[in-house]
Amino acid sequence: AGVFELQIHSFGPGPGPGAPRSPCSARLPCRLFFRVCLKPGLSEEAAESPCALGAALSARGPVYTEQPGAPAPDLPLPDGLLQVPFRDAWPGTFSFIIETWREELGDQIGGPAWSLLARVAGRRRLAAGGPWARDIQRAGAWELRFSYRARCEPPAVGTACTRLCRPRSAPSRCGPGLRPCAPLEDECEAPLVCRAGCSPEHGFCEQPGECRCLEGWTGPLCTVPVSTSSCLSPRGPSSATTGCLVPGPGPCDGNPCANGGSCSETPRSFECTCPRGFYGLRCEVSGVTCADGPCFNGGLCVGGADPDSAYICHCPPGFQGSNCEKRVDRCSLQPCRNGGLCLDLGHALRCRCRAGFAGPRCEHDLDDCAGRACANGGTCVEGGGAHRCSCALGFGGRDCRERADPCAARPCAHGGRCYAHFSGLVCACAPGYMGARCEFPVHPDGASALPAAPPGLRPGDPQRYL
């Protein structure tokens, strides 16, 4: 469990031409408030999909009245943080929507009127317990500056808030493999249910008492790095210094290759590389001429007219060895870049790229917004394996160049009227309703139908809701 915290720094006109008109006037003074909606993962979800990680409303900001003739300044903001509690693990990747709302305070019949000024969205990676992350987002001509972080609520700790804390058993230190629970240094991480001593960095468990290792680590406690060089050849010169816990006697122990053949291990057995004039599984066959057809896989035999002179096999592409007996492991040259997985299909090489990379050899980094323009106030967002434009409302398409009619789907509930606006749609709600889509009923005294106010919030102020 933990809390996602959002701090709004400023909301005002963005840079460039076309400064927006102030949302408030002498005739219609207003104040701002904000709503944040969080969803797990990096999915491109519709704004209307549920805020599965949670949502929150800010308090209302100070009342603001436009000074005649003055350009719209940064608008006065509500005090405090927006806090979105999450009950389960922090997912690490999340999508957010931050809405700026205007509350008009004129003589409205039925109480104040709410309307959406701007909405920004994005997808981010964030570890719980880390520092504040700063961000700037634009919606039409407006610019929103904010910071956010995720922090764990005691007794949870860790980057996903999945580990637990407990009071120290000993006054000076924590137990085996357990760290102090920052910032609660007088508490310690609770013992994991994994196997005793299992590395919390490189081991994990899905059942009590087990210790399963992350890739690259081995041993009962996952404390030994796997070194592929020594693990492939445990008797080689490097094995004494790598610490690799390799299996027992290897298939090459005692060198099964005859006649000076050299042995190399394969995943299931061994393979002999034979000197010229010998072949067979263990290089045991000798006295070969081209008449014996020693070249495999379509290799061309040259020379070797009598048993005393060596023959040479000219191998076709994809094969090697003195008898063209070995398929070339083209993946051993590590042709796939950026951590791509190499697949040798025989007729061709394929690279299966990690998210964020593309190209025949995974050479193109997709997670790079440089030089990528999103039109109409859209924001380029990295992640999910490609660049994407997060478009301002009212625009769509790959580069946010397509104009949408946001009102076509009749999005305003409870009789709200829909207006196409420079920043997307705006719902003018019927008296008694509020929200981006007029979805929230409002009590007659102006308080929303939300949970009771927590300490520090006056009744009638918007609250968090989930």
């Epitope: 085996p176 493999g177 760290r179 196997r195 005793a196 001593g197 299992c198 590395s199 919390p200 960095e201 087990e210 041993g219 009962p220 406690l221 404390t223 030994v224 790095p225 004494a240 210094t241 790598t242 610490g243 690799c244 816990l245 390799v246 299996p247 027992g248 006697p249």
Partner: antibody, heavy 114, light 112 residues
Framework: QVQLRESGPGLVKPSETLSLTCTVS????????WGWIRQPPGKGLEWIGY???????SYNPSLESRVTFSADTSKNQFSLKLSSVTAADTAVYYC????????WGRGTLVTVSS | EVVMTQSPLSLPVTLGQPASVSCRSS???????????LIWFQQRPGQSPRRLLY???TRDSGVPDRFSGSGSGTDFTLKISRVEAEDVGIYYC?????????FGQGTKLEIK
């Protein structure tokens, strides 16, 4: 080739804290876990515990209330502190690569005496 | 914790003759991945321990092939096929299957 070298005072007074440092050369502290083992004079070996460069540690329960490990990646060193020592803590202290125990330091004798 | 018991504690051997050290554990050292995490060390006089065998029977590079390891479950043996003068020292078994790791008390090999 990986080499380990222990260093620290050879004499510690009873009830004080024993402090030793192990310097790793030929490998990065970040590549492995690292451990401490001790051997009282004329006796057998006892595993004290391990540390990873991030600070993750595991201690032998028989010593855990008195032991603290730390790591300094900038110096490629890791350290052992053993508090409230008695004569029973007199031993040769070795550092080693944890889990595999394939590389050991030469050891340093620490005597606890007033 | 797992108790490791070695025998004999002292082993006088004639040069060129075989030698055998036994190590017994109070719990099975067979781990769920199919490996037996038992290590054998040699400690020559005045030196640090040196790993000879790991995972029961895998010999370290540079270790003569006269050293071999065998056993399963809770009973293990280190064999030296022909003892040489340089083999004098104390031999320890160590289990790293269970936490905390534990050593045998050592077997002192000396030349008769």
């Amino acid at each position: 080739q990986v080499q380990l070298r222990e260093s620290g005072p050879g004499l510690v007074k009873p009830s004080e804290t024993l402090s030793l440092t192990c310097t790793v050369s030929g490998d990065s502290l970040k590549n492995s876990y690292w451990g401490w083992i001790r051997q009282p004079p004329g006796k057998g070996l006892e595993w004290i515990g391990y540390i990873y460069y991030s600070g993750t540690s595991s201690y032998n329960p028989s010593l855990e209330s008195r032991v603290t490990f730390s790591a300094d990646t900038s110096k490629n060193q890791f350290s052992l502190k053993l508090s409230s020592v008695t004569a029973a803590d007199t031993a040769v202290y070795y550092c080693s690569r944890e889990g595999s125990f394939d590389v050991w330091g030469r050891g340093t004798l620490v005597t606890v005496s007033s | 914790e797992v108790v490791m018991t070695q025998s004999p504690l002292s082993l006088p051997v004639t040069l060129g003759q075989p030698a055998s050290v036994s190590c017994r554990s109070s719990q099975s050292l067979l781990y769920s991945d199919g490996n037996t995490y038992l290590i054998w060390f040699q400690q020559r006089p005045g030196q640090s321990p040196r790993r000879l065998l790991y995972k029961l029977s895998t010999r370290d590079s540079g270790v003569p092939d006269r050293f071999s390891g065998s056993g399963s479950g809770t009973d293990f043996t280190l064999k030296i096929s022909r003892v040489e003068a340089e083999d004098v020292g104390i031999y320890y078994c160590m289990q790293v299957t269970h936490w905390p790791y534990t050593f045998g008390q050592g077997t002192k090999l000396e030349i008769k």
